[in-house]
Amino acid sequence: AFGISGVQKYTRALHDSSITGISPITEYLASLSTYNDQSITFALEDESYEIYVEDLKKDEKKDKVLLSYYESQHPSNESGDGVDGKMLMVTLSPTKDFWLHANNKEHSVELHKCEKPLPDQAFFVLHNMHSNCVSFECKTDPGVFIGVKDNHLALIKVDSSENLCTENILFKLSET
């Protein structure tokens, strides 16, 4: 995993700049791990960043991600009167100028260097789940979540009508 010292040097001014035309309501610097306590790590390989899901060695420092929170209206056709309510969306940035990005065609999660304003593919609806977990749903593809597949992050379609175990789309956020 590469050093994420750049994240620690983020300033409020940097992220108060217009990203989607609005400022984030808050930000949170956290390590990201799976439901089974594997760490999400980021490595620079051949001038591009790779994302891994791995067990860290004891005392190995966890990579950090900056979560920027935004309010958003749920894009639901069910309720034009807004009764579905506002929800929270996040962008995730492990190092300066790079954001997690949903590649819906490849069903993959990638790190892209993005210009502001950030594309919709960089935004995820944040789901508050039990067991101190969250899930990240693609803004661009409702029902598709960031999940773990073969020790990598991938996009996973979750159908609420199916009886499937969703531990692979549950993540823990930790300040340590």
């Epitope: 808050t26 949170y28 639901s76 309720s79 929270l88 508050n128 609420s160 956020l173």
Partner: antibody
Framework: EVQLVESGGGLVQPGGSLRLSCAAS????????MNWVRQAPGKGLEWMAE??????????HYAESVKGRFTISRDNSKNTVYLQMNSLRAEDTAVYYC????????????WGQGTLVTVSS | DIVMTQSPDSLAVSLGERATINCRAS??????????LNWYQQKPGQPPKLLIF???SQGSGVPDRFSGSGSGTDFTLTISSLQAEDVAVYYC?????????FGQGTKVEIK
């Protein structure tokens, strides 16, 4: 129009049972966590129970005061959530509201009008 | 359980004046970098209505005169200019931990 309509309330003797129903319409019911919240006459709000989705294994959670006596369940084919109340006590007398959490599960944003349950001999 | 305590229990404010309601949690309701603190308004004979979520974000369709602030254990709901239709009971609620708990409510009346 998004709507929750409760039914099944009424007068019941202490120790008795009652089943409340909540019929949902105007939204994709199977996508939302559902709750029951009650309010004793002239008192404040008290959260009772919650049921999640099929892909969360329909996990349920209860307030301590009703654990073991009340059971929340749902039937997605009927767009209905239920609250089975057993071993009722006088202190369970209240208006019972069916409530839906928002998409993403951050807060309750749809409420029914409530149904009154009176436990008295 | 997290105990939520509101103050004052009741409040009489002149039309157009500011109303402030406080809510204190027995332990922090912060998680994931946000405060799991919601505010609801309940008018007589009606179910509650969401005003504020995650401490400071307005619910859909909520007038701008309602605002929320705070983090950790101490929170405030402010009505910047009280209107006649704001007469109601206001509740804070934490949704960080089960059981979700409400404050005892604050009754707002016109002076």
């Amino acid at each position: 129009e998004v709507q929750l309509v409760e039914s099944g309330g009424g007068l019941v003797q202490p120790g008795g049972s009652l089943r409340l129903s909540c019929a949902a319409s105007g939204f994709t019911f199977s996508n939302y966590w559902m709750n029951w919240v009650r309010q004793a006459p002239g008192k404040g709000l008290e959260w009772m129970a919650e049921i999640t989705l099929k892909f969360n294994n329909y996990s349920t959670h209860y307030a301590e005061s009703v654990k073991g006596r009340f059971t929340i369940s749902r039937d997605n084919s009927k767009n209905t959530v239920y609250l089975q109340m057993n071993s009722l006590r006088a202190e369970d007398t209240a208006v019972y509201y069916c409530a839906r959490r928002n998409y993403g599960n951050w807060y309750i944003n749809v409420w029914g009008q409530g149904t009154l349950v009176t436990v008295s001999s | 359980d997290i105990v939520m305590t509101q103050s004052p229990d009741s409040l009489a404010v002149s039309l157009g004046e500011r109303a402030t309601i406080n809510c204190r949690a027995s332990e922090s309701v912060d998680k994931f970098g946000v405060s799991f603190l919601n505010w609801y308004q309940q008018k007589p004979g009606q179910p509650p209505k969401l005003l504020i979520f995650v401490a400071s974000s307005q619910g859909s369709g909520v007038p701008d005169r309602f605002s929320g602030s705070g983090s950790g254990t101490d929170f405030t709901l402010t009505i910047s200019s009280l209107q006649a239709e704001d007469v109601a009971v206001y509740y804070c609620q934490q949704s960080k931990d089960i059981p979700y708990t409400f404050g005892q409510g604050t009754k707002v009346e016109i002076k």
